[in-house]
């Protein structure tokens, strides 16, 4: 008799998901000597644990703790680039300019990014058919918990000035429900953190729309002045630049100092 | 080191027509937005004119536009500006500028300038 | 378009302290850019940014940028910065300007 399985609303987990995070760690370690020392192995041991067996709608942080462990990493805390509702363009950017950070351009980013992945419960295999929606079914999923736990972390960690890069073709410049906007906001330390900076960018070629007087814009400068955090916003016009130099990183166009 | 060279300045009549050249070298020419600003004689700066890596985007002061075109050759790192029905006004001297990298919009390099002097 | 106010002339003691604002819209939601002409001379790049120094600028030079005032510094002035000073910012399009300039005198 088949066994009854639940139907999730999402996409499945990530097919070879299981290979293609060991490889990622195996590529990272590689290309970032201060995480040589990494078990790869261990990672993925770590990571199959937080989920594996467990109702894929009662994750919690908790269940991440092995992983985040492991996965301990020291970025430079005044180099971090925070982005929203513009991923493509966040991860082009320190493509070329290196000594800045993004979330995915850690090991853990990395290893998850643009993945889907969870399990049943009591059993151990991995469901590559569905997996829980943020929405229609549940909030407290690998992935999102997952997101929210390494999102939380990373805004810890960063200090002095602080830039998100956010969309400025999107109805909603600043999403509150995003998860910069519900987790990595309310997680800058103002102790450590001067300033968060946000870099507007915009999509039209004769835009010269001041989208930093957006009422979500507004939106977000209050409530980092509310946690004692100074705000400042600048619109960017030409982020074909950044594309410009995806395609020949090398070049001197691409790099700030001058 | 960047060197940005301009030439073709000269003296013009009201209505005539000029197009200077601006030699790049030092950097990679086809990289880069590149600038035309221009200076009257005791005054400040005015920016012209801007045209992006590719050519394919350019844009115009108000004050010249539909009268001057700018235009590059990026296998021979050059920069042009075509100018037409020249006016007394637009006597100044006319700078090549490099744009900043990133984020910025600036200018990071300039041309020592040429000279262009409408008279009759 | 925003419009770059800027004061005529500046002048100051060597040794002391000058400020050059340039005032504009919002100017804060916008990179200014400070540039140095000397007479006869093309400018230079001397802060970019807001308050960034290019390579080979003396660190007496620095900038800031908050409110609708951008603000350029130089403290300890010298002889040799005695020079013409402009702003400049981009607004999108076709509105790349500079403000009026700003004569600095060294006393």
């Known amino acids: 008799v088949p066994r009854w399985r639940q139907q999730w609303s999402g996409p499945g987990t990530t097919k070879r998901f299981p290979e293609t995070v060991l490889a990622r760690c195996v590529k990272y370690t590689e290309i970032h000597p201060e995480m040589r020392h990494v078990d790869c192995q261990s990672v993925w041991d770590a990571f199959k644990g937080a989920f594996i067996s467990k109702h894929p709608c009662n994750i919690t942080e908790e269940d991440y703790q092995p992983l985040m462990k492991l996965g301990t990493q020291t970025v430079p805390c005044n180099k971090i680039l925070l982005w929203s509702r513009i991923k493509d363009l966040a991860h082009q950017f320190t493509q070329v300019q290196r000594d800045m950070f993004t979330l995915e351009d850690t090991l853990l980013g990395y290893l998850a990014d643009d993945l889907t992945w969870c399990g049943e419960f009591n059993t151990s295999k991995i469901n590559y058919q569905s997996c829980p929606d943020w929405r229609k079914d549940c909030s407290n999923n690998p992935v999102s918990v997952f997101w929210k736990t390494v999102s939380r972390r990373f805004a810890e960690a960063a200090c002095d000035v602080v830039h998100v890069m956010l969309n400025g073709s999107r109805s909603k410049i600043f999403d509150k429900n995003s998860t910069f906007g519900s987790v990595e906001v309310h997680n800058l330390q103002p102790e450590k953190v001067q300033t968060l900076e946000a870099w507007v960018i915009h999509g039209g070629r004769e835009d010269s729309r001041d989208l930093c007087q957006d009422p979500t814009i507004k939106e977000l400068e209050s409530i980092i002045s509310k946690r004692n955090i100074q705000f400042s916003c600048k619109n960017i016009y030409r982020p074909d630049k950044f594309l410009q130099c995806v395609k020949n990183p090398e070049d001197s166009s691409c790099t700030s100092e001058i | 080191q960047v060197q940005l060279v301009e030439s073709g300045g000269g003296l013009v009549q009201p209505g005539g027509s000029l197009r200077l050249s601006c030699a790049a070298s030092?950097?990679?020419?086809?990289?880069?937005?590149m600038n035309w600003v221009r200076q009257a004689p005791g005054k400040g700066l005015e920016w012209v004119s801007y045209i992006n890596p590719n050519g394919m985007m350019t844009n115009y002061a108000d004050s010249v536009k539909g009268r001057f075109t700018i235009s590059r050759d990026n296998s021979k790192n050059t920069l042009y500006l075509q100018m037409n029905s020249l006016r007394a006004e637009d006597t100044a001297v006319y700078y090549c500028?490099?744009?900043?990298?990133?984020?910025?919009?600036?200018?990071?390099?300039w041309g020592q300038g040429t000279l262009v002097t409408v008279s009759s | 378009d925003i419009e770059l106010t800027q004061p005529p002339s500046v002048s100051v003691a060597p040794g002391q302290t000058a400020r050059i604002s340039c005032s504009g819209d919002?100017?804060?939601?916008?990179?200014v850019y400070w540039y140095q002409q000397k007479p006869g001379q093309a400018p230079v790049l001397v802060i970019y940014?807001?308050?960034k120094r290019p390579s080979g600028i003396p660190e007496r030079f620095s900038g800031s940028n908050s409110g609708n005032t951008a603000t350029l510094t130089i403290s300890g002035t010298q002889a040799e910065d005695e020079a013409d000073y402009y702003c400049q910012t981009y607004t999108g399009g076709a509105s790349l300007v500079f403000g009026g300039g700003t004569k600095l005198t060294v006393l």
């Open positions: 500028a490099r744009d900043l990298p990133l984020v910025y919009t600036g200018f990071a390099y």
């Open positions: 919002n100017l804060r939601h916008y990179y």
């Open positions: 030092g950097f990679t020419f086809s990289s880069y937005y």
């Open positions: 940014g807001d308050s």
